[in-house]
């Protein structure tokens, strides 16, 4: 008799197989919080960039990638205090003289209003009400994202 | 009548409220190789170490984390040409001079024999029969993972 | 109880050195930037530098660069002001503060030790 | 540098009097001020950040407002505790973090 986690196991199997989905998030995990199609987690130490960035990736998710000017809002109504400073998966990349998301796409100028440098070694953070460009040497906090809802297609076969 | 995708979820969440897990894969997404408890990506592009470790972020994973000299040789097996080499998620601190892993702990020596230097900006990769420091700016492949089975207790509260 | 102590004040010669030593308590000291602040005899305040929470950065103005040391020990909940080629005017209290958390660089002082005085006379 | 110039120099008040201090960067500074108070032989105490955001446990009487180059502490009923020298400082993330020259609040 197999448990109904087991049971899953072989239901979502057959569900990949048929539709190539990555086995998602159905629930956000404890700690973190529901935005939309998205778990995201606020953390409470600070770090450079870098250190938050590998922070996220061993927590088996991603610095926070912002999709448009309306989800920076949502997400910027979750923090609480008007100075504190998260950083997010975008950095400023010194070859492409752009700001670039850590998925390799590139900021639409239009989605975030920068306040600060684009610069070498610059990265971004927001606030409650503002983008910055801060140093990635910076020590503050940070947002991990993980996707909610399976992603039909999401095969990842290679960047 | 809900689909069994649909009753999977009710009863993973069962699960995950009864024991604090977090909602862990139940099987490896298309492309990802099974070792064990995890699921690997082996990258057939090149990257520096910093991208390396920003791509297996936004694909929510960690670049590879090695537990011991066991683990190791069974990555290695893996790896079909003798040449080549990945990066993992091990690199050099220097306010710490010591190797640390992306998740903050250190290396305990005895675990992997490193070729090369413990030096500012080196980071550390595999080939089939070795494993080596390298210049973090080197483009080479790299090893993302993920976690196969759900971890107990395993909760994120914060880093 | 949260606070600051700072100690290691006293009169010194011009040419001379000091190290002004700042114990915190009642938080997370690893978490903070943290900062040295003085303030001459009936003047106002002046920033001389300050150590990012894991001691990797740090900052110093232009008026003390080069004679003056910030360092911290998280294990002992302590931060620390080297000073050498004291100067007469380097006569001030000096306090330690610490910034608001996450705020990064930018450093707001929410809260200071009571000061301590360095007199640079001959 | 930023300069940063507080103005008046000193003000006599009255209890229940509205004080207002401005405080003058050189160059732009988005939102980035801090109000402090400082009693005789006392550390300063953050009253304001962010420009506007009241520091926990200072009492509402006291407010911050201003963006950009031109800011300003309003204390809307002196109290007879308030009496001190009020000093702004620049945040921007970029040492110096320099203070302005302060502004004495007295007694009338």
């Known amino acids: 008799q197999k448990s109904s986690i087991e049971k899953c196991s072989v239901d979502i199997q057959q569900s990949r197989n048929k539709t190539t989905e990555r086995p998602g998030l159905l629930n956000c995990p404890i700690y973190w919080q529901q935005l939309r199609e998205k778990c995201l987690l606020f953390s409470h130490t600070v770090n450079p960039w870098n250190n938050s960035l590998a922070d996220c990736s061993t927590k088996e998710s991603s610095l926070l990638l912002i999709r448009d000017k309306d989800e920076l809002i949502h997400t910027q109504n979750l923090i609480r205090d008007k100075a504190i400073l998260f950083w997010i998966g975008l950095n400023f990349s010194l070859s492409e003289k752009n700001w670039k998301w850590i998925n390799g796409s590139f900021l639409n100028s239009n989605d975030l209003e920068i306040r600060g440098d684009a610069k070498e070694n610059s990265c971004i953070s927001i606030s409650q009400t503002s983008v910055y460009s801060e140093y990635c040497s910076t020590e503050i906090r940070w947002i991990c994202q993980k996707e909610l809802t399976p992603v039909r297609n999401k095969v990842y076969p290679d960047s | 009548q809900k689909s069994s995708i649909e009753k999977c979820s009710v009863d993973i969440q069962q699960s995950r409220n009864k024991t604090t897990e977090r909602p862990g894969l139940l099987n490896c997404p298309i492309y990802w190789q099974q070792l064990r408890e995890k699921c690997l990506l082996f990258s057939h592009t090149v990257n520096p170490w910093n991208n390396s470790l920003a791509d297996c972020s936004t694909k929510e994973s960690s670049l590879l984390l090695i537990r011991d000299k066991d683990e190791l040789i069974h990555t290695q097996n893996l790896i079909r040409d003798k040449a080549i080499l990945f990066w993992i998620g091990l690199n050099f601190s220097l306010s710490e001079k010591n190797w640390k892993w992306i998740n903050g702990s250190f290396l305990n020596s005895n675990d992997l024999e490193i070729r090369g230097d413990a030096k500012e900006n080196s980071c550390i990769s595999i080939s089939q029969t070795s494993v080596y420091s390298e210049y973090c700016s080197t483009e080479i492949r790299w090893i993302c993972q993920k976690e196969l089975t759900p971890v107990r207790n395993k909760v994120y509260p914060d880093s | 109880q949260v606070q600051l102590v700072e100690s290691g004040g006293g009169l010194v010669k011009p040419g001379g050195s000091l190290r002004l030593s700042c114990a915190a308590s009642g938080f997370t000291f690893g978490q903070y930037y943290m900062s040295w602040i003085r303030q001459a005899p009936g003047k106002g305040l002046e920033w001389v530098s300050y150590?990012?929470?894991?001691?990797?950065?740090?900052a110093y103005a232009d008026s003390v660069k080069g004679r003056f040391t910030i360092s911290r020990d998280n294990a002992k909940n302590s931060l620390y002001l080297q000073m050498n080629s004291l100067r007469a005017e380097d006569t001030a209290v000096y306090y330690c503060?610490?910034?608001?958390?996450?705020?990064?660089?930018?450093?707001?002082?929410?809260?200071w030790g009571r000061g301590t005085l360095v007199t640079v006379s001959s | 540098d930023i300069q940063l110039t507080q103005s008046p120099s000193s003000v006599s008040a009255s209890v229940g009097d509205r004080v207002t201090i401005t405080c003058r960067a050189s160059?732009?500074?988005?939102?980035?001020l801090a109000w402090y108070q400082q009693k005789p032989g006392k550390a300063p105490k953050l009253l304001i950040y962010a420009a506007s955001s009241l520091q926990s446990g200072v009492p509402s009487r006291f407010s911050g407002s201003g963006s950009g180059t031109d800011f300003t502490l309003t204390i809307s009923s002196l109290q007879p505790e308030d009496f001190a020298t009020y000093y702004c400082?620049?945040?921007?993330?970029?040492?110096?973090?320099?203070f302005g020259g302060g502004t004495k609040v007295e007694i009338k």
């Open positions: 503060a610490r910034s608001l958390m996450s705020t990064g660089t930018h450093l707001y002082f929410d809260l």
């Open positions: 150590i990012s929470p894991s001691g990797a950065t740090i």
């Open positions: 400082q620049q945040v921007t993330s970029f040492p110096p973090y320099t």
């Open positions: 160059q732009g500074i988005s939102d980035w």
